[in-house]
């Protein structure tokens, strides 16, 4: 229904908490390079305006939109030019036209330092003295690194921060208490931003349509008792949430999907028999416990896919009368049945079933044409399933740090013109679905891997839109979402790449290296493996082995040494004329 | 084209029963939810009842509960709705739906009238 003041009804919805957390982090997904205390002038500043409105939806500007009124807001402040340089020209636009520019200089890869956690004490400390504040700069450091991050489940992850930190603030050893639970809240939230942004991808590059058919198969796995017009209805308010979302109406957004849990909740009886431990739940725990929520047990006396979808006499009047619906049918019907398959390979074969029906409906004897259909998805079914075994027996051999350099050196050989950082990036996080997804039950694997993949992968291509350097990868990135990851998969080594010349200062390291973290260490060291890559792209398994294994012992050596900065100096020369003779 | 026929309607004193039915073509029945819905003299619509296709699940308003009965025959195509123990209040126009979406309906029959008085 209509409402006079949008951001009344939003504010009166949401709760001021809420509310005031979902515009700072609108504020900080559009203006990324502005500090904290700027962000929370202006969060204040809005907060104050829509409790006016609250009081009274006829006072002035009340009934301007929260784009307008948002936009409004940034376009004031000082010296944005400066700062933000083109983004500034949004400003000169009108609404819609402004909101779009904004979206569009959104930076995925904004020039920011890692998110670096302050030490136990200081951490509680600064949370105990303003919970509110910590909590909001927390909000804004994510956002702002993670433009397109859900903003609803930004809002959980706060939450979740802030029970972590009530509970081992009080602890004796905060750090012991504080870092493996920080840890996992960072993890999961690390993969929900990847998750986020590759639904986002999908709603820009391929419109609802798309995105609605990932959500039916979806929806479809974990609901296998609902009816197709049920799992119509939640893929239908689910693609409406994150096209919100994705488009910056982060308030609307974020009450559509309390409206949507509130619905849920009271429709278990036609969704699902495992939702009510989720519907007991506070409003933001709720939501994310049913987006989280285990799978339904399939229905024992489904008939075969085949009567309805093959062996029907009529499917080509079907298909005819309503192609997407007919279309949507087959896929739920599927989906609904294979839990054990990867939302990805599920759409590969509703577009391989498609694509027959096309044909066949159009030849003088359909029946004929599409009677094999079923048996012609196996090659699709078998192509993922053995990219996991494969894969999972390799990090079982490697262990995930090893498994990570394996992919780095596969990777940097396919696309050796992607910069090394990228590289690094995408190799550690595509080496994380071994320990992420292996250690699964054998049909949970599946759907883990693949859909991981596709999320991290798309994360490359986002990255690479922005400096295109390969066309490999461009290529890859181009086609279908679904089709990406056994792209990637397929692509062998770049024949066209002259490799890089090799530069002595590349792999020159001094006694700094010593005392970074671990996780630092290995990125300096998988650094130099992307730079061997690229410097001997057709370098055997066991020249590189020979090299990193050198170079391990080498910083090893040197870390230990009485004379750090000398056992550098001097065994560093050494260590850079035995790689390049080895790799010769 | 789709095409919802529905039948059964008449007059019926209080108490009486009735069996309204509708008879669809133009879309593959078996694959849709299917409902009745009712509109009174000067009154809004009202959902009466609404049945899964496989007719595993079935919804029913309050003030129809334990006195109406929908079921469906999908060899048939076929919808039906057993009105015993009627009353005044269940006097309107029972138009036969068929929905695309759990909560939406996007087509209607012409309705059939049923008229309870004594």
């Known amino acids: 229904e209509a409402h006079k003041s949008e951001i009344a009804h939003r504010f009166k919805d949401l709760g001021e908490q809420h509310f005031k957390g979902l515009v700072l982090i609108a504020f900080s997904q559009y203006l990324q390079k502005c500090p904290y205390e700027e962000h929370i002038k202006l969060v204040q500043e809005v907060t104050d305006f829509a409790k006016t409105c609250v009081a009274d939806e006829n006072a002035e500007n009340c009934d301007k939109s929260i784009h307008t009124l948002f936009g409004d807001k940034l376009c004031a402040i000082p010296k944005l030019r400066d700062n933000y340089g083109e983004l500034a020209d949004c400003c000169a636009k009108q609404e819609p036209e402004r909101n779009e520019c904004f979206l569009q200089h959104k930076d995925d890869n904004p020039n920011l330092p890692p998110f670096q956690r302050p030490e136990a004490e200081a951490m509680c400390t600064s949370f105990q003295e303003n919970p509110t504040s910590f909590l909001g700069h927390y909000l804004h450091e994510v956002a702002r690194r993670h433009p397109y991050f859900y903003a609803p489940e930004l809002l959980y992850y706060a939450e979740k921060y802030n029970e972590v930190l009530t509970q081992c603030c009080t602890e004796s050893d905060k750090a012991a208490c504080l870092t493996p639970k920080l840890d996992a809240v960072k993890e999961k939230a690390l993969v929900a931003a990847v998750r986020q942004r590759m639904k986002c991808s999908s709603m820009q590059r391929f419109g609802e349509r798309a995105f609605k058919a990932w959500a039916v198969a979806r929806m479809s796995q974990r609901f296998p008792n609902a009816e197709f017009a049920e799992i119509t209805k939640l893929a239908t308010d689910v693609t409406k949430i994150n096209k919100e979302c994705c488009h910056g109406d982060l308030l609307e957004c974020a009450d559509d999907r309390a409206e949507l849990a509130k619905y849920m909740c009271e429709n278990q009886a036609t969704i699902s028999s495992k939702l009510q431990a989720c519907c007991d739940k506070p409003v933001l725990q709720k939501s994310q416990c049913l987006a989280e929520i285990e799978h339904d047990n399939i229905p024992a006396d489904l008939p075969s896919i085949a009567a309805d979808f093959v062996e029907d006499k009529e499917v080509c009047k079907n298909y005819a009368e309503a192609k997407d619906v007919f279309l949507g049918t087959f896929l739920y019907e599927y989906s609904r049945r294979h839990p054990d398959y990867s939302v990805s390979l599920l759409l590969r074969l509703a577009k391989k079933y498609e694509a027959t029906l096309e044909k066949c409906c159009a030849e003088g004897d359909p029946p004929a044409c599409y009677g094999t259909v079923l048996a012609e998805f196996q090659p699709l079914v078998e192509e993922p399933k053995n990219l996991v075994k494969t894969n999972c027996e390799l990090y079982e051999k490697l262990g995930e740090y090893g498994f990570q350099n394996a992919v780095l050196v596969r990777y940097t050989q396919k696309a050796p013109q992607v910069s090394t950082p990228t590289l690094v990036e995408a190799a550690r996080n595509l080496g994380r679905v071994g320990t992420k997804c292996c250690t699964l039950p054998e049909a949970q694997r599946l759907p883990c891997v693949e859909d991981y993949l596709s999320a991290i992968l798309n994360r490359l291509c986002v990255l690479h839109e922005k400096t295109p350097v390969s066309e490999k990868v461009t290529k890859c990135c181009s086609g279908s979402l679904v089709e990406r990851r056994p792209c990637f998969s397929a692509l062998t080594v770049d024949e066209t790449y002259v490799p890089k010349e090799f530069k002595a200062e590349t792999f020159t390291f001094h006694s700094d290296i010593c005392t970074l973290p671990d996780k630092e260490k290995q990125i300096k060291k998988q650094t130099a493996l992307a730079e061997l890559v690229k410097h001997k792209p057709k370098a055997t398994e066991d020249q590189l082995k020979t090299v990193m294994g050198d170079f391990a012992q080498f910083v090893d050596k040197c870390c230990k040494a009485a004379d750090k900065d000398n056992c550098f100096a001097t065994e560093g020369p050494n260590l850079v004329a035995r790689s390049k003779e080895a790799l010769a | 084209e789709v095409q919802l026929l529905e039948s059964g309607g008449g007059l019926v004193q209080p108490g009486g029963s009735l069996r309204l039915s509708c008879t669809a073509s133009?879309?593959?029945?078996?694959?849709?939810?299917m409902g009745w819905v009712r509109q009174a003299p000067g009154k809004g619509l009202e959902w009466v009842s609404w049945?899964?296709?496989?007719?595993?699940?079935?919804y029913y308003a309050d003030s129809v509960k334990g006195r109406f009965t929908i079921s469906r025959d999908n060899s048939k195509n076929t919808l039906y709705l057993q009105m015993n123990s009627l009353r005044a209040e269940d006097t309107a126009v029972y138009y036969c739906?068929?929905?695309?979406?759990?909560?939406?309906?996007?087509?209607w029959g012409q309705g059939t009238l049923v008229t309870v008085s004594s």
């Open positions: 739906a068929k929905s695309y979406m759990a909560d939406r309906f996007d087509y």
């Open positions: 049945i899964r296709p496989d007719g595993t699940f079935t």
């Open positions: 133009g879309f593959t029945f078996r694959h849709y939810r």
